[in-house]
Amino acid sequence: CDLPQTHSLGNRRALILLAQMGRISPFSCLKDRHDFGFPQEEFDGNQFQKAQAISVLHEMIQQTFNLFSTKDSSATWEQSLLEKFSTELNQQLNDLEACVIQEVGVEETPLMNVDSILAVKKYFQRITLYLTEKKYSPCAWEVVRAEIMRSFSLSKIFQERLRRKE
C-alpha cells in the first residue's frame, strides 16, 4: 500500500492546525511541563512489518482524536480550528484503515503489534490523567497541545521512513 501523499499532507495540516490552536504563551506554562514518556522505541519502525507499523500510527491518531473530542477540549479550543483538526484526523484514520486492509492481504500477518499499541495507549492515559490532575487548566492543555505536536512530528519522521520503504 502506498501511504498516500494526501496522508502526508494531512499530517502537515494537522500540525499547522495544532500550532494555530495555541492561545497562551508556552513560556507562561513552564512550571506545568511534564514528561509523558512518549514511546519513541515504538516509532523506530525497523522491527515490524508495514501493517503493524500502520496500526501503531492508527492508534496514535485515534487516541489524539479521542482526546480532542472531549467536552473539556471543546471548552478550551477555538471551535472552528478544533473542527478542522478533528476532520483532518478523521481523514488520516480513514487513509490508514484502507492501507491496513490492503497490507494484511499482502502480508497475511496479524494486524496489530499488541505491545506497541499498548505502549501508545499508556502514553495517552498519562496525558489524560495529567489533565485530570491539573483540572483541565489552560496551562495543562497548552502543555498537552505542545506534547501532541511533538509526538506528531516524531511520527511524521516515522511515516516518511515508511514511505521510503515502499
Partner: antibody, heavy 122, light 107 residues
Framework: EVQLVQAGAEVKAPGESLRISCKVS????????ISWVRQIPGKGLEWMVK????????IYNPSFQGHVSISVDKSITTVYLQWSSLQASDTAIYYC???????????????WGQGTLVAVSS | DIQMTQSPSSLSASVGDSVTITCRAS??????FHWYRQKPGKAPELLIY???NLQTGVPSRFTGSGSGTECTLTITSLQPDDFATYYC?????????FGQGTKLDVR
C-alpha cells in the same frame, strides 16, 4: 498463562527495612502497569502505587508517598515494594496486580498475585 | 479523594437467591466502576469491569449496571462459591479507591 507470583510471608521488627517481590510471567512485562494494593487483616483494600515497567514511570497514592517505594527489574520481570523503616501499622497483606487498559483508557485489575503477609512486631 | 460507599455492609442469603449490592461514588466516575470478589484467605478476583462488562470466565449470573455516581452488582441464583466479600472500585481519579466491602454470608 498470566501469573504474578509473590514472595512468602515476612516477620520484621519496627524500624527494619524490607523489600517484597512480585515475579511476573505469561505476557510481555513492559506492556502493562503493575500496582500494589494493601489489605490490613480483616479490613478493606487500599491502592498504594503503580508503575509502568517500560520506563519506571510511577504514580503514588499520597497516603503512601514517602513511606514506600516501588521499582522494577526488567531483566527478571519482577516488581518490588520497599520500606526503609517499617512501622507496626504496616502489618498487612500486600497484593501485586496487573492493570488492563481498555481502548477508552479505563484501567482495572485483571490479575492478582496471591499476596504477601508482612507482620511488623517488636 | 473519591469516596466509594457500598451498601449494605453485610448481607445474608441462601443458595439460589438473588442479591443486589450498590456502590456510590462521592463524585462522578463515569463508567470507571469495577467489581471484585474476595473469598476467605484468597486474593480478590475481577468480576465486572467498566460498570457492566463481564470478565472472561466469570459466570453470567453476575451483572453490573450504572454509571456516574452509582453502580450495582446483581448476583442471581447464588452458588456456594459466591459467599464472599465484594468490593467496588473506581479508577477515574487518583488515588484509586475501593468501597469498604460487602460481606455476603449464608442465611
Amino acid at each position: 498463562e498470566v501469573q504474578l507470583v509473590q514472595a512468602g510471608a515476612e516477620v520484621k521488627a519496627p524500624g527494619e527495612s524490607l523489600r517484597i517481590s512480585c515475579k511476573v510471567s505469561g505476557y510481555t512485562f513492559t506492556s502493562y502497569w503493575i500496582s500494589w494494593v494493601r489489605q490490613i487483616p480483616g479490613k478493606g483494600l487500599e491502592w498504594m502505587v503503580k508503575i509502568d515497567p517500560r520506563d519506571s514511570y510511577t504514580i503514588y497514592n499520597p497516603s503512601f508517598q514517602g513511606h514506600v517505594s516501588i521499582s522494577v527489574d526488567k531483566s527478571i520481570t519482577t516488581v518490588y515494594l520497599q520500606w526503609s523503616s517499617l512501622q507496626a501499622s504496616d502489618t498487612a497483606i500486600y497484593y501485586c496486580v496487573r492493570h488492563y487498559l481498555t481502548q477508552s483508557l479505563v484501567d482495572y485489575f485483571d490479575h492478582w498475585g496471591q499476596g504477601t503477609l508482612v507482620a511488623v512486631s517488636s | 479523594d473519591i469516596q466509594m460507599t457500598q451498601s449494605p455492609s453485610s448481607l445474608s442469603a441462601s443458595v439460589g437467591d438473588s442479591v443486589t449490592i450498590t456502590c456510590r461514588a462521592s463524585q462522578s466516575v463515569s463508567n470507571y466502576f469495577h467489581w471484585y470478589r474476595q473469598k476467605p484467605g484468597k486474593a480478590p478476583e475481577l468480576l465486572i469491569y467498566s460498570a457492566s462488562n463481564l470478565q472472561t470466565g466469570v459466570p453470567s449470573r453476575f451483572t453490573g449496571s450504572g454509571s456516574g455516581t452509582e453502580c450495582t452488582l446483581t448476583i442471581t441464583s447464588l452458588q456456594p462459591d459466591d459467599f464472599a466479600t465484594y468490593y467496588c472500585q473506581q479508577t477515574h481519579g487518583y488515588p484509586f479507591t475501593f468501597g469498604q466491602g460487602t460481606k455476603l454470608d449464608v442465611r
